[in-house]
Each structure stands twice: as structure tokens, then as C-alpha cells.
Interface confidence: medium
């Protein structure tokens, strides 16, 4: 993570004191310009060797309140013939994010930052097999 | 795009007037933070028939001010000998995860939250095969 | 790459402090936290706390909580351990580390040290 | 605090052997550990780290393994420069904490 400005104004804190409450402008900005969400949907869950399907994770006092979540279709991954290979196997790419999330009965309205951990994608790696030893 | 929560206290308020500037929790940053769960070991960007690099992208006035971002290694896949199958792509999951940009010369500090498309990882996919007319 | 250059060794009296600076070159000073960690002579390693500069935090381990200070100054790359109420417990080498602190393999904050300073030799002894 | 125990204390090896060192926490710790190596009077080098990513400069006869609880540091064909001390280190929970260190020497 990164910055500290350091001046009299802006001393170092402790993080049990730290400044529990600051200002955070919520017009969501997209720092690639263009809008992202505007991007087509993958079909990628449906063509790859490791499918997966998408979940609707919701939460009204969220940001974002809808979140899809990733979980693969089957534990081992899809052969050229359309079969299960048993020494393939399908595993879960995930990832943090940052959410909002409001404080209860909070007004003016008051948000914490929570990391959340997802499921994005699947893909396909070769079992490991494990010696006896 | 922003939470609007309903309360009597709190009207309901138009996207477009609502409070840019709202108290935020960043409690999630002490160093060690609120974390979700223990990390997971993965290595599958290694292991993958749709193996991937870590890319460094780097902003010092944004939290995380590093993020390493997948590119796939291969336009194909990994077949079982290790070889490339000319039938199978690699293709990039990618994810959109909110970031804090710090606003310049703010103190106390004042963050606006963008969105940013990252690459997490890749998966192997069936080439789609265009049909001449 | 990263290099932390510290401040040169000290020798002091039981009761008093020491200020030891660490100096960063190469890489944005704000992409990452300093963490510091003392080694007694022939003894391991010991965490005694660190900055995450984003927010300007710090954090400290709970042995060390009332008498370490950790201090980073943007302008001049430099961070800062004083360490006040010294003992002869308290002689050691005192190094900085690099803490990443990035968004690396699908998670936030990395806390592996991936760069050390030199270290500096603290003295106490009457 | 998490305690993070490594075995052994010592290892006395001969060149071109291989090297298993094992650190156990406390408690889980998911994959986050990391593996030092430090040699007389110098300052502790990072090798792995989140318990099986190599970095970039350090020889691929180093390598880890584990997650959870049980975590390995494996050296592959010692060399005679691999003569140091070897730390763990969690930082899945604060305080950060370490092994107290293998020493290994060549015979």
C-alpha cells in the first residue's frame, strides 16, 4: 500500500487510533475511461476445458449489491471429446475485491471498506499425484 | 453508482445529488487488516494447461498501489506432452475490483474509489472454428 | 530494485533511546510498508512492528507497544524506529525490511519482507 | 501469538544432498510463510515466499511446499555458498513471528 504524508498536519497513526472515518467520494470513477462494466459478457464459463457456472451473490446494503460468483461446473476438466479427464482437475481462480458496505441505521449515510474473497473463473491443472513414501 | 440507502431520517436521494464525500470505515487497512481468510496456497498460474505471468502495475497514489495483473503465457494451451494444441487458446479471466485513488495533496486524507478491469488469471478454450459463407 | 541503507551503529546507556533511520532508493517509496525486526546476538528473529504508508499506520508488536515509535518521512524516503527505556535486553542488530504490501495472486496486501537493510548494532550497557 | 517451531536446530550435509527443512505453526496459517536464508553477519535474504513461490534470483534448487499448518523448505543438491541459517515467518496474524532458525553446514 502506499503514502504517507507526512507533515505536522498529517501525522502518523497508530492503527488502533487511526482515523476510523474518512472522507471517500463515492462517484465511482473507472480509471480505463471508457465505462467497464459496459464490456460484453465471456462465454468462456461455457467453452472451457474447466466450465464453470455463475452465482448471484446479493446484498442491498452493499457496493457493489450484486456480486456473480464463480464456481466450477465439475471437479475434473472437459477432454476434447466432451469427456471428464481423471487427470485433469478444475479449480476456482479467486480473488479479493473491496466492497462498501453501510453501517446499520447510519445517517448521514457512513460506509466501511470490507475485502471480500471470489470465485472468478476456473481452470484446468494436472492432478498431483502424491508418493507413498 | 453508489448504495442509496431508504430511511426517514435519511430521504431518499438522486444518484446525481447524492453526497460525493461520505464517511468511510478503512478499519480493513490496518496492515494485517480484517483478513477474509487465509490465503490459499496457488500456483496454479504455473500448473494450468492456460498458464499465465504476473505483471507489475504499479500507481503510488492508489491503494493497492501494486497490482500484478495475469497475462496469459501462450496464445495456445499445454497439452498433456507439454506441447501446444493448435485447437485449444489460451483466454484471460478478467475481473473488476475497486481501488482507492488518494485525492492529491488531500490532508486529512480523501480517497474517491475507481473501478479497474484486472487480468486474474486464464483458462484453455475451444477455437472457434469461422465457417466460410 | 528496492535498497534500504541504514543509520550507522549506536552504543547507549540503560534508560535511553535510540533513533535509527532506514533509507529507501529505487522504487516508489509509497508502494510498500517498512517493517522492522531485531536480532539479539546469537538469537533469531523478532517482529517489532511496521508502517503501511498508504494510510500512514502503524503497527506494533504488543512487547514492544509504549516504547517503540515508527516514523516515515515521503519527502526524504527515509523510515524511523526509536526505541525509548533501553535495557541491555535490548542490544541487537535492528533491521528494516521492505513489506510489498501489493495486490499480488488474487489478494490484497503481501507481507512477505523482500528487502532488507544492512542493519545497525545497538549497544546498551552502563 | 502464533509459534512457529523448525526442525532440526542443526544440519551438518554434504555437498550435492538434499535438505528438508520443516516449520510447524501454531495454528493455520493458510500459505502464509515465507523462508529466509541468512549467513554469518549478513542480513536475511528472502527465498520463498506464501510457501511455494520462488523469487526471481534465487536458485531453482531452493523450493517449498505446505500450507495450513506443516510447511517444508527443500534444497536440492546443496552447494557449499548454501552454508547459513534458515528462518520461517508467518504473517498470516500479528504479531509477525519466526522460527527460531536451522543452521545448516556443509561436512
Known amino acids: 500500500a502506499a503514502i504517507i504524508p507526512q507533515s505536522s498536519a498529517c501525522p502518523n497513526t497508530e492503527a488502533k487510533d487511526f482515523l476510523q472515518n474518512v472522507k471517500v467520494n463515492l462517484k465511482v470513477f473507472n480509471s480505463l475511461g471508457a465505462k467497464v462494466s459496459s464490456r460484453r459478457p465471456s462465454d468462456y464459463l461455457n467453452r472451457s476445458t474447466s466450465p464453470w457456472t455463475l452465482h448471484r451473490n446479493e446484498d442491498p446494503d452493499r457496493y457493489p449489491s450484486v456480486i456473480w460468483e464463480a464456481q466450477c461446473r465439475h471437479q475434473r476438466c472437459v477432454n476434447a471429446e466432451g469427456k471428464l479427464d481423471h487427470h485433469m482437475n478444475s479449480v476456482l481462480i479467486q480473488q479479493e475485491i473491496l466492497v462498501l458496505k453501510r453501517e446499520p441505521e447510519s445517517c448521514p449515510f457512513t460506509f466501511r471498506v470490507e475485502k471480500m474473497l471470489v470465485g472468478v473463473g476456473c481452470t484446468c491443472v494436472a492432478s498431483i499425484v502424491r508418493q507413498a513414501a | 453508482a453508489a448504495i442509496i440507502p431508504q430511511s426517514s431520517a435519511c430521504p431518499n436521494t438522486e444518484a446525481k445529488d447524492f453526497l460525493q464525500n461520505v464517511k468511510v470505515n478503512l478499519k480493513v487497512f490496518n496492515s494485517l487488516g480484517a483478513k477474509v481468510s487465509s490465503r490459499r496456497p496457488s500456483d496454479y498460474l504455473n500448473r494450468s494447461t492456460s498458464p499465465w505471468t504476473l505483471h507489475r502495475n504499479e500507481d503510488p497514489d492508489r491503494y493497492p498501489s501494486v497490482i500484478w495483473e495475469a497475462q496469459c503465457r501462450h496464445q495456445r494451451c499445454v497439452n498433456a506432452e507439454g506441447k501446444l494444441d493448435h485447437h485449444m487458446n489460451s483466454v484471460l479471466i478478467q475481473q473488476e475490483i475497486l481501488v482507492l485513488k488518494r485525492e492529491p495533496e488531500s490532508c486529512p486524507f480523501t480517497f474517491r474509489v475507481e473501478k479497474m478491469l484486472v487480468g486474474v488469471g486464464c483458462t484453455c478454450v475451444a477455437s472457434i472454428v469461422r465457417q466460410a459463407a | 530494485e528496492v535498497q534500504l541503507v541504514q543509520s550507522g551503529a549506536e552504543v547507549k546507556k540503560p534508560g535511553e533511546s535510540v533513533k535509527i533511520s532506514c533509507k529507501a532508493s529505487?522504487?516508489?517509496?509509497?508502494?510498500?510498508?517498512i517493517s522492522w525486526v531485531r536480532q539479539a546476538p546469537g538469537q533469531g528473529l523478532e517482529w517489532m512492528g511496521g508502517i503501511t504508508h498508504f494510510f500512514g499506520i502503524t503497527d506494533y508488536a504488543q512487547k514492544f507497544q509504549g516504547r517503540v515509535t515508527i516514523t516515515a518521512d515521503e519527502s526524504t524516503t527515509t523510515a524511523y524506529m526509536e526505541l525509548s527505556g533501553l535495557t541491555s535486553d535490548d542490544t541487537a542488530v535492528y533491521y528494516c525490511?521492505?513489506?510489498?504490501?501489493?495486490?499480488?495472486?488474487?489478494?490484497?496486501?503481501?507481507?512477505?519482507?523482500?528487502?532488507w537493510g544492512q542493519g545497525t548494532t545497538v549497544t546498551v550497557s552502563s | 501469538e502464533i509459534v512457529l517451531t523448525q526442525s532440526p536446530d542443526f544440519q551438518s550435509v554434504t555437498p550435492k544432498e538434499k535438505v528438508t527443512i520443516t516449520c510447524r505453526a501454531s495454528?493455520?496459517?493458510?500459505?502464509?510463510l515465507h523462508w529466509y536464508q541468512q549467513k554469518p553477519d549478513q542480513s536475511p535474504k528472502l527465498l520463498i515466499k506464501y510457501a511455494s513461490h520462488s523469487i526471481s534470483g534465487v536458485p531453482s534448487r531452493f523450493s517449498g511446499s505446505g500450507s495450513g499448518t506443516d510447511f517444508t523448505l527443500t534444497i536440492n543438491g546443496l552447494e557449499a555458498e548454501d552454508a547459513a541459517t534458515y528462518y520461517c515467518?508467518?504473517?498470516?496474524?500479528?504479531?509477525?513471528?519466526f522460527g527460531q532458525g536451522t543452521k545448516v553446514d556443509i561436512k
Open positions: 515467518h508467518q504473517s498470516d496474524t500479528l504479531p509477525h513471528t
Open positions: 529505487g522504487g516508489s517509496f509509497r508502494s510498500y510498508g
Open positions: 525490511a521492505r513489506e510489498p504490501n501489493d495486490f499480488w495472486n488474487g489478494y490484497y496486501d503481501t507481507h512477505d519482507f523482500d528487502s
Open positions: 495454528q493455520n496459517i493458510g500459505s502464509e
